[in-house]
């Protein structure tokens, strides 16, 4: 069978070979597509309800005024010249539906390096048959499931018109250190071959590199933690990070009741300051960030000052 | 909302002439085949003729060929059907419908126009 | 041409009955029957359309099935409203063809 590809809603002509080229005619087509259940038989003189899918020109041609998806199918003629000579057409046809350019839509302006993220989710409208999406950084593909790369990929079909809308929502985890200005793109390759891709305007979002987590430093003084009955520990949280972020307290995992300062004091010491205290980095970009724990005690006169007192009461310090 | 709106019928001798009208409204007219069917007093529903959504083709049954015609006028939304050398068998209420061709069937009729055929 | 043959032409029932009416296409028609239903002095209202689909904003009480070229058309449940005359109609082929027509009448 000849394969032919036609484009949903163009008219469509296929040639009856053999066949005379006017009427008297012994010809007879017949279909076997997604408008019948078996074979259609059309003829010459047939004219009827399914003129307005397919009708028999006067030259024997079969004429489809607008092919539509279930014209999908087998077409086959057989005629019979003025000597009685049987020839036979056999036509596969397939069709298919460029969509709209794709688009990328809910893109993101910016992207946190070492996370994932959410890139964008794009979109093609309108196609026949599906096709696939595909995502690109700095023009070259993006390989779902590696490096950090993952593609949420949805495909649903118009109820009236069959054509399919497809969706690929992009998440990737940028490294650290990288193109701060990376580039994206999506483009839409056809179901069919023969037809080129279609790409998506650009995107480039920044890529913000947080401060890592080991970067909030707590100090204490005096170093180690362990003071005289009535002595003062002054504890300081250093956060590198542009803007100072919010700094607050915990001690044995609790948060202290204490306004945001990156400075905790501890005057005139007693049981029931002993404990674990952490300080909590919060930055109004992304989320919280804990440093190390240090062990407040108590050193009882006559003892060695250890590096690390016991766990003690819930005494409030103050802020400096 | 589909609507289709039959006028034209009343009575007329035998062998006289009759031309129907059906105006349509609510949906792009130019997109549809159209035909015309009728129903006879305490009868089942007859075809009667249609035609493409371009106006280029018709088609009748043998009982009503030659006699009469189906017509339109896109730019105007309506369907006609003159009807020449009528006979009393010819005496029904007349239905306009959307359709006729195996995209559509017959969806959506007109409430008829009565066409009486009688000396 | 091609000969719709429905039947029974006439039938009586009672509200909350199972009804079936069958048309029987003296040749293949494919898929391209529609069903209407009729009351007196009214135009015919599509119920189904291409056999099987349910046209839009009847109830699904009426139903269409097919069977090589045998069509039925089935209320589940019969409701007063549903009192009427009910039509077959194929338009596979010139010329259009509509069944003769079942009455149904209450019991």
């Known amino acids: 069978a000849q394969n032919i590809t036609a484009r949903i809603g163009e008219p469509l002509v296929l040639k009856c070979k053999g066949a005379p080229k006017k009427p008297p005619q012994r010809l007879e087509w017949k279909l076997n597509t997604g408008r019948t259940e078996a074979w259609k038989v059309l003829s010459p003189q047939g004219g009827g309800p399914w003129d307005s899918v397919a009708r028999v020109l006067p030259n024997g041609s079969l004429f489809l005024p607008a092919v539509g998806i279930q014209d999908e199918g087998i077409f086959r003629c057989q005629a019979m010249n003025r000597n009685g000579k049987e020839t036979k057409s056999n036509y596969r046809v397939r069709v298919y539906q460029i969509p709209g350019k794709p688009e990328i839509v809910d893109s993101a302006s910016e992207l946190t390096a070492g996370v994932p993220n959410k890139v964008g989710t794009c979109v093609s409208e309108g196609s026949y048959p599906a096709g696939t999406l595909s995502w690109h950084l700095d023009g070259k593909p993006l390989v779902p499931n590696e490096k950090g790369v993952s593609v949420k990929e949805q495909t649903r079909r118009h109820p009236e018109t069959g054509l399919f809308t497809l969706q690929s929502e992009l998440m990737v985890t940028p490294a650290r250190g990288g193109d701060p200005r990376p580039t994206f793109s999506c483009s839409f390759s056809p179901g069919l071959p023969r037809h080129r891709a279609l790409r998506t305007a650009p995107i480039q979002p920044r890529v913000w590199e947080p401060v890592p987590l080991e970067e909030v430093q707590l100090v204490v003084e005096p170093e180690g933690g362990a003071v005289a009955p009535g002595g003062t520990v002054t504890l300081t949280c250093e956060v590198p990070a542009q803007p100072s972020p919010q700094i607050h307290w915990m001690k044995d995992g609790v948060p202290l009741p204490l306004p945001p300062s990156p400075v905790l004091i501890l005057p005139e010491i007693g049981p029931q300051d002993q404990g674990t205290y952490s300080c909590v980095a919060t930055h109004s970009s992304h989320g919280p960030q804990e440093s190390r724990a240090v062990s407040i005690s108590i050193i009882e006169p006559g003892e060695e000052g250890p590096t690390a007192g016991s766990v003690g009461g819930s005494g409030l310090g103050t802020l400096a | 909302e589909v609507q289709l709106v039959e006028s034209g019928g009343g009575l007329v001798q035998p062998g006289g002439s009759l031309r129907l009208s059906c105006a349509a409204s609510?949906?792009?007219?130019?997109?549809?085949?159209m035909t015309w069917v009728r129903q006879a007093p305490g009868k089942g529903l007859e075809w009667v003729a249609s035609?493409?959504?371009?106006?280029?083709?018709?088609y009748y049954p043998d009982s009503v060929k030659d006699r009469f015609t189906i017509s339109r006028d896109n730019a105007k939304n309506s369907l006609y059907l003159q009807m020449n050398s009528l006979r009393a068998e010819d005496t029904a209420v007349y239905y306009c419908?959307?359709?006729?061709?195996?995209?559509?069937?017959?969806?959506?009729w007109g409430q008829g126009t009565l066409v009486t055929v009688s000396s | 041409d091609i000969q719709m043959t429905q039947s029974p032409s006439s039938l009586s029932a009672s509200v909350g009955d199972r009804v079936t009416i069958t048309c029987r296409a003296s040749?293949?028609?494919?898929?391209?029957v529609n069903w209407f239903q009729q009351k007196p002095g009214k135009a015919p209202r599509r119920l189904i359309y291409?056999?099987?689909n349910l046209a839009d904003g009847v109830p699904s009480r009426f139903s269409g099935s097919r069977s090589g070229t045998d069509f039925t058309l089935t209320i589940s449940s019969l409701q007063p409203e549903d009192f009427a005359t009910y039509y077959c109609l194929e338009f596979d082929e010139h010329p259009l063809t509509f069944g003769g027509g079942t009455k149904v009448e209450i019991k």
């Open positions: 040749q293949d028609v494919g898929i391209y």
């Open positions: 609510g949906f792009t007219f130019n997109n549809y085949w």
């Open positions: 291409r056999a099987t």
């Open positions: 035609i493409d959504n371009s106006g280029d083709n018709t």
């Open positions: 419908a959307r359709g006729g061709d195996i995209l559509v069937g017959l969806d959506y």
